[in-house]
């Protein structure tokens, strides 16, 4: 087992909130059995850890929010993997169980004497994790112990089912909405024949299912649908790309309800197989505007249209984060590892020096270099504030006129906290209203992004539209520059005058061959030719029949 996973970030407090962030990438296929995590992550990992620590500092220094109560935290690494996250969640639960036993005076030493040892405070709620599949597994465990969970990026539709996931809430909308947005984009550009790819796991599977259902209702055909694991090997991605290629040149558009690393796997396979420019990827919010998806594979990603949950950058987070340094940041146990990975150098002489790097980190290095804030930062912070406001409301109702934790609130009852959380309504970090519907979901608005070549060897994401409450707005000129550039993704072109569609057995309804009607036939509907009755003949536009005018022959008429 990987020791890095057992590292925990602590911040003391009267009430402890748990958090699961993907501080490291998920284990590769060959390392899954050992649960050995991958490389350290900045946006999804370190930034979120720092957001938790700093947001709690801000909450604790706000005299109007939880006065006389200090919020602390215990942050663990989910590695974007169910087995790892479950293992870490069990640690949260264990803390709670030990604490509740201690409350009941059950803590005893091996020799039978009573213990003066104070165990850790129980976790009252959990923030995260990021992945839907992982969040489901974690929720299955947490709800057994009445521990509310607030997610900041788990968007699977399944999680709306309160009969299954009672203690789950989220500050993001359900994926049903972005599936609709993706279908609306496909419709807008008359792409009637597209390939589909999704990441194996709940996020991809339920999202793609919704996309396919909505597509069918709109007359959009799926050439073929494929699924792949995010951590699949090169061979699997190459095989998938070859299958997608088999649908060219007809299915040029590939709708990808995918996690970011799945998209990256596709881009890398495109590079290996020399397929840059062959496809247009339409990506879900797992891709959004992430540079860690496209870095090094920009040529392959060009033209990609992606869905991004609307969440503006949080300025005060950058003001805090960009000043962090490895020699002074001791409360984040992953920070030195991250610093070395980020700058590809070793923190020579530090206890966590990574000898795989030869170069010593210069003291002039700064996080300002190539800084990109996590695109879901606002949601992470809103999730933390939601927990704080929920606790605040609970304290107000259980301890009226009392500052601090009163006896009625000790130990914190998860059922009452859930009730209080569901009623939470406050102004979020970006000025938006944060509230939860009966399913614990939040309303959402999406931005439509386009990955473009902005100049020679300079690529970036451009905001080209929005999807809000069922309404799609797109700046077509920004995406295509001129109408003739709009990519076509159709199986068959419309039939010419006098032709009907013949759909071959086993083919989807968007694929046909055009067959002309016989000389005496007209086009009855797009699939049928009908013969004109005796005495009538097809009209010029071949859409009906006209009576043949009767011509009487006279003796003097020339031979026809």
């Amino acid at each position: 087992q990987s020791s890095e996973r057992r590292v925990v970030a602590h911040m003391p407090g009267d009430i402890i909130i748990g958090a699961l962030f993907s501080v490291h990438h998920q284990p590769t296929v060959d390392k899954v059995h050992e649960r050995k995590c991958g490389a350290v992550r900045e946006q999804y990992g370190i930034q979120r850890v720092e957001a938790m620590l700093h947001t709690l500092e801000r909450i604790n220094s706000d005299p109007t929010l939880l006065p006389n109560i200090t919020l602390g935290c215990e942050i663990r690494d989910s590695c974007w993997h169910s087995a790892v996250a479950l293992e870490q969640s069990i640690e949260f639960i264990r803390d709670s169980l030990i604490s509740s036993e201690e409350e009941e005076g059950l803590v005893r030493c091996v020799d039978g004497s009573s213990s003066s040892f104070r165990s850790k405070k129980p976790i009252v709620g959990v923030i995260g994790p990021g992945s839907s599949s992982v969040a489901i597994q974690v929720q299955n465990l947490l709800q057994l112990f009445n521990i509310p969970q607030i997610a900041y990026s788990a968007t699977s539709m399944d999680l709306s089912d309160k009969t299954l996931f009672k203690y789950f809430m989220r500050v993001v909308p359900s994926d049903a909405q972005q599936a609709r947005a993706m279908v609306d984009i496909v419709k807008r550009y008359n792409w009637t024949y597209v390939s589909a790819v999704h990441t194996e796991g709940n996020y991809g599977e339920s999202g793609m299912e919704a996309f396919k259902d909505m597509s069918a209702k709109e007359g959009i055909c799926i050439a073929h649908s494929y699924k792949i694991y995010s951590n699949a090997g090169e061979q699997s991605f190459d095989k998938l790309l070859k299958k997608l290629t088999s649908h060219l040149p007809k299915a040029r558009v590939v709708a990808c309800f995918c996690e970011g690393m799945t998209v990256r796997g596709l881009l890398m396979a495109m590079r290996r197989l020399g397929l840059a420019g062959e496809f247009l990827l339409l990506g879900s919010d797992g891709w959004a505007d992430r540079y860690d998806v496209t870095d090094g594979y920009q040529r392959e990603a060009v033209g990609g249209i992606t869905i991004k949950l609307q969440s503006p950058d949080v300025k005060w987070f950058d003001d805090y984060y960009l000043k962090l340094r490895p020699e002074t940041n001791h409360r984040n146990p992953w920070f030195q590892e991250f610093w070395q990975h980020r700058f590809q150098c070793r923190l020579e002489g530090f206890p966590q020096e990574n000898s795989k790097y030869n170069k010593t980190c210069n003291s002039s290095l700064t996080l300002k270099t190539h800084h990109v804030q996590d695109s879901k930062m606002g949601f992470v912070i809103n999730a933390i504030y939601s927990m704080a406001y929920g606790l605040h409301n609970m304290q107000m109702s259980l301890c009226p006129g009392y500052a601090g934790l009163c006896d009625a609130m000790k130990p914190i009852d998860g059922r009452k906290l859930l009730e209080s959380l569901m009623k939470t309504n406050f102004t979020g970090v970006s000025g938006d209203t944060i509230l939860f519907d009966e399913n614990g979901d939040s309303p959402g608005r999406y931005e439509i992004m386009n990955f473009k070549e902005m100049g020679k060897d300079y690529f970036d994401y451009i905001n080209v539209g929005s999807w809000d409450n069922g309404e799609l707005k797109m700046d077509d000129d920004e995406v295509w520059s001129k109408k003739s550039n709009i990519i076509r993704s159709v199986c068959s072109e419309p039939c010419e005058k006098g032709q009907i569609k013949v759909i071959r057995k086993g083919e989807v309804s968007c694929c046909w061959t055009c067959t002309p009607c016989k000389e005496n036939e007209y086009v009855f509907d797009e699939y049928t030719c009908k013969a004109c009755q005796l005495g009538s003949w097809p009209t010029d536009d071949l859409t009906g029949c006209d009576l043949i005018p009767v011509q009487y022959l006279r003796w003097g008429d020339p031979e026809p």
């Epitope: 020699e327 002074t328 070793r346 923190l347 020579e348 002489g349 530090f350 206890p351 020096e353 030869n358 170069k359 010593t360 980190c361 210069n362 003291s363």
Partner: antibody, heavy 118, light 109 residues
């Protein structure tokens, strides 16, 4: 081995460039080449290091601005010194390490004497 | 900047005896300390790195210990050839900088 050259007598406010030549090994990405000076009867004083891999430089705070370390070829490193004063009179050593300092310097040149005097 | 304070400035001991030299750092430098031996007209010679690791070819009579701010070099079974000046060099990772101690002269009788 490493050997320094370029020392000698220089007037105050003058400039001088010292050269360190490595032989028997390449200045590969494994090594750091550093300059250390020692005034007569005093202890050594660290000046600067350069990482041979990509030329990243590391300086003592007092040396920044007046001293410049550079890798000029796969076997040579130089130290440019400007605005020299009598306090800069010392034997200047070139030393090799596998870091800026935490592993010590395991190969030293014999040194070259720099005298700053009018 | 980091300051390395070495004590004593001079020590005298008989052949076969033991000498202990101390070095104190003004900041926590973890285990980032090296010990050197220098004889007149020669460059320093590395004896110990990372506080306690013996450089190859150096006799095991030389022993380094300590971490944080307090470090010690112990030379046991003194030989005439050990007569030299010994310097500690501290590396301060937070500032990526080095400093040498003032030196300890060892006289062997």
């Amino acid at each position: 081995s490493v050997e320094e050259s370029g020392g000698g007598l220089v007037k105050p406010e003058g400039s001088l460039t010292l050269t360190c030549k490595a032989s028997g090994f390449d200045l590969s990405s494994y090594y750091y080449m550093c300059w250390v000076r020692q005034a007569p009867g005093k202890g050594p004083e660290w000046i600067a290091c350069i990482y041979a891999g990509d030329g990243t430089t590391y300086y003592a705070s007092w040396a920044k601005g007046r001293f410049t370390i550079s890798k000029t070829s796969s076997t040579t490193v130089t130290l440019q010194m400007t605005s020299l004063t009598a306090a800069d009179t010392a034997t200047y050593f070139c030393a090799r390490g596998t870091g800026v300092g935490s592993y010590g310097y395991n190969l030293w040149g014999p040194g070259t004497l720099v005298t700053v005097s009018s | 900047d980091i300051v390395m304070t070495q004590t004593p400035a001079s020590v005298e001991a008989a052949v076969g005896g033991t000498v202990t030299i101390k070095c104190q750092a003004s900041e926590n430098i973890y285990s980032n300390l090296a010990w050197y031996q220098q004889k007149p007209g020669q460059p320093p010679k590395l004896l110990i790195y990372r506080a306690s690791n013996l450089e190859s070819g150096v006799p095991s009579r030389f022993k380094g210990s300590g971490s944080g701010t307090e470090f010690t070099l112990t030379i046991s079974d003194l030989e005439c050839d050990d007569a030299a000046t010994y310097y500690c060099q501290g590396y301060y990772p937070s500032a990526v900088t080095n400093a040498f101690g003032g030196g300890t002269e060892v006289v062997v009788k």
